[in-house]
């Protein structure tokens, strides 16, 4: 049966025992900016180009031991996510990915901006259709790295980040709070903010909506068939990238701003429990839970 | 995220050194009285300094992100540091990121061209 | 354009092991795995495994588990398929095809089992 | 794995429209979005025609369509043509493998 996830996204009409707009995204392409992946896992097979961009920090600790299974957990799941065959949203899009993160998840400000920059001279150097850009990352507030993401929005490009796992205030983490980026925070199976261990998702007026992003199936890296469940604000962004994707193929002259309010507007309003965000933030947090147009636009989205 | 907000750099640390006038005998000498910021993260674990990202002013090219770059190099050699660029931008933000001694901060905030320096820091997979 | 091109006809003596080869060209190799099925005279075709050219991981169908072994040679685009201990109901026409989805396909390679 | 059930033999007239079923269970065809159909012309390899239930790949004609409701997978061909009589296969996902029916022989009267 249909995961949860994917049918919390998907408009009523569809809800049948399966999820299938079976080519959704197909004239765009997602940029993940990622760990490693595993390209060939069964569930993304063809779907994922691997570019020859790598800019990562060697790992800590002098006894970590490089295990490539899980170098490429978080980007193959994330990769699945967006466009997986079996559980992905966007199962037509195609995807690039580059890696900025290293096999322990982390990354750096300095590698993330030449990564922006490498998909903006491919951008240029040939241009194709609508790109979405997925960050399914977080730092501490950086001007630099807002700064890039600005820029790339300028120039056309869609980017969709996770609004961060600290349980915090999206607003000083980045690229969260590049307003220019489509920041999603993460609620669960019962529309609740997402716990994550002692923290979860990021809240605040930085986050432009919530998705999926608990409990989320996807591709593992353990084996080449193999499927895991996954949390975190990074899941919910790629639901979000999946959807753009999906929008963006149905109708590729959208600006980002029109883009940004279609999201708005068929999102479920006023579902998630406000009680778990702090009191002074409850206002400024945004009650919507990212979902798919509904049967309107039948044959642009499920074509 | 959330388009329409005013930017807050929330705890975001600013730096500023205003800069002085004594400027190395520089040909291409800032415009009097700008100010170049210097930026680091607020989280301190997530620092990594002694990698800093120069950003300089938006219209500038990219021959000249270069000879800001070396001039950055020539100064620091003079001084006794050795420095390393790693990257050149262009494409997007014009600037370069460098690989230096945190002593030499008020002087690549007084290099032309410049409009801050951010010391890099670390990003997490969420 | 994309190719898989595999090596010549076999024949082999009950026993014996064969090792297939299987080269790609034509696509990013690390963007599929390739798969090995075959096909006996007369029958229906016959998923045997599959071996990833990113990481050289396999996945074996149970009923050739342990008889065969998938390798492969990243530096010359070329996957292998050997397969030990042959009977002769091991006569088939062994062929390499693009990924699991299977998409492109090698012209194939007949293995004879004969004594 | 056993094989997924497919008939035998199909035929049909030229400019007629055929239907190929495949029957498997709720762990490969109503499992996954993931069933493909071959056609293989003797002593060939064979050919993909349909992945994915219902995608056609470039090149392919429009005359072939697929679909799945629940377990069975179906690939429809119509205005069948001289040239369309061959061996066709159908395959599935499996949790952790790829199971092939047993081909059907399309004959063109």
């Known amino acids: 049966s249909i995961p949860w996830n994917l049918e919390r996204i998907t408009p009523p009409r569809y809800r049948a025992d399966e999820y299938q707009p079976p080519d959704g995204g197909s004239l765009v392409e997602v940029y993940l900016l990622d760990t490693s992946i595993q390209s060939d896992h069964r569930e993304i097979e063809g779907r994922v180009m691997v570019t020859d961009f790598e800019n990562v920090p060697e790992e800590d600790g002098t006894r970590f031991h490089r295990q490539a299974s899980k170098c490429d957990s978080h980007g193959t799941h994330l990769a699945g996510v967006v466009s997986g065959r079996d559980a992905g949203v966007a199962k037509g899009a195609s995807m690039r990915s580059l890696r900025v993160l290293n096999c322990q998840g982390k990354g750096t400000v300095s590698g993330t901006l030449i990564g922006l920059e490498f998909i903006r001279k491919s951008q240029l150097v040939q241009p194709v259709g609508p790109l979405v850009v997925l960050l399914p990352l977080a730092g501490g507030y950086s001007r630099v790295l807002n700064a890039a993401c600005q820029r790339l929005a300028r120039a056309g490009v869609v980017l969709v980040t996770a609004a961060g796992n600290f349980r915090d205030d999206a607003c000083l983490y980045s690229p969260a709070s590049a307003p220019e980026v489509i920041t999603v925070g993460a609620t669960n199976a019962q529309d609740q903010p997402v716990t994550l261990g002692t923290l979860g998702t990021n809240f605040g007026r930085c986050v432009d909506l919530f998705a999926p992003g608990e409990d989320i199936i996807g591709a593992s890296s353990d084996c080449s068939t193999c499927f895991v469940s996954q949390s975190g604000t990074s899941q919910a962004a790629a639901h979000v990238a999946g959807i753009a994707a999906m929008m963006l193929s149905a109708e590729p002259e959208l600006t980002l701003a029109e883009l940004r309010q279609r999201l708005i507007h068929f999102s479920a309003k006023d579902v998630i429990n406000e009680a778990w965000f702090p009191e002074d933030q409850r206002v400024l947090t945004p009650n919507l839970v990212a979902a798919l147009p509904p049967s309107t636009h039948e044959n642009l989205y499920f074509q | 995220g959330a388009m329409g907000q005013e930017d807050e750099d929330g705890d975001y640390e600013e730096l500023v050194l205003a800069l002085r006038s004594e400027e190395d005998g520089l040909a291409e000498a800032p415009e009097h009285g700008t100010t170049a910021t210097f930026h680091r993260c607020a989280k301190d674990p997530w620092r990594l300094p002694g990698t800093y990202v120069v950003v300089l002013k938006e219209e500038t090219h990219l021959s000249q992100s270069e000879r800001t770059a070396r001039r950055l190099q020539a100064q620091a050699a003079r001084r006794g540091y050795l420095t390393k660029i790693l990257h050149v931008f262009h494409g997007l933000l014009p600037g370069f990121l460098v690989k230096m001694s945190g002593d030499l901060l008020e002087l690549a905030l007084k290099l032309p061209h410049v409009d801050y320096i951010e010391e890099d820091s670390s990003v997490f997979a969420q | 354009q994309i190719q898989l091109v595999q090596s010549g006809a076999e024949v082999k003596k009950p026993g014996a092991s064969v090792k297939v080869s299987c080269k790609a060209s034509g696509y990013p190799l690390t963007s599929y795995g390739i798969s090995w099925v075959r096909q006996a005279p007369g029958q229906g075709l016959e998923w045997m495994g599959w071996i990833s050219a990113y990481n050289g991981n396999t996945n074996y169908a149970q009923k050739v588990q342990g008889s065969v072994t998938m390798t492969t040679d990243t530096s010359t685009s070329t996957v292998y398929m050997e397969l030990r201990s042959l009977r002769s109901d091991d006569t088939a026409v062994y062929y390499c095809?693009?990924?699991?989805?299977?998409?492109?396909w090698g012209q194939g390679t007949t293995v004879t089992v004969s004594s | 794995q056993s094989a997924l059930t497919q008939p035998a033999s199909v035929s049909g007239s030229p400019g007629q429209s055929i239907t190929i079923s495949c029957t498997g269970t709720s762990s490969d065809v109503g499992g996954y979005n993931s069933v493909s159909w071959y056609q293989q012309y003797p002593g060939k390899p064979p050919k993909l025609k349909i992945y994915?239930?219902?995608n056609r790949p470039s090149g392919v004609s429009n005359r072939f369509s697929g679909s799945k409701s629940g377990n069975t997978a179906s690939l429809t061909i119509s205005g069948l043509q001289a040239e369309d009589e061959a061996d066709y296969f159908c395959s599935s996902y499996t949790s952790t493998s790829m199971v092939f029916g047993g081909g059907t022989k399309l004959t063109v009267l």
């Open positions: 095809a693009r990924g699991y989805g299977m998409d492109v």
């Open positions: 994915e239930v219902s």
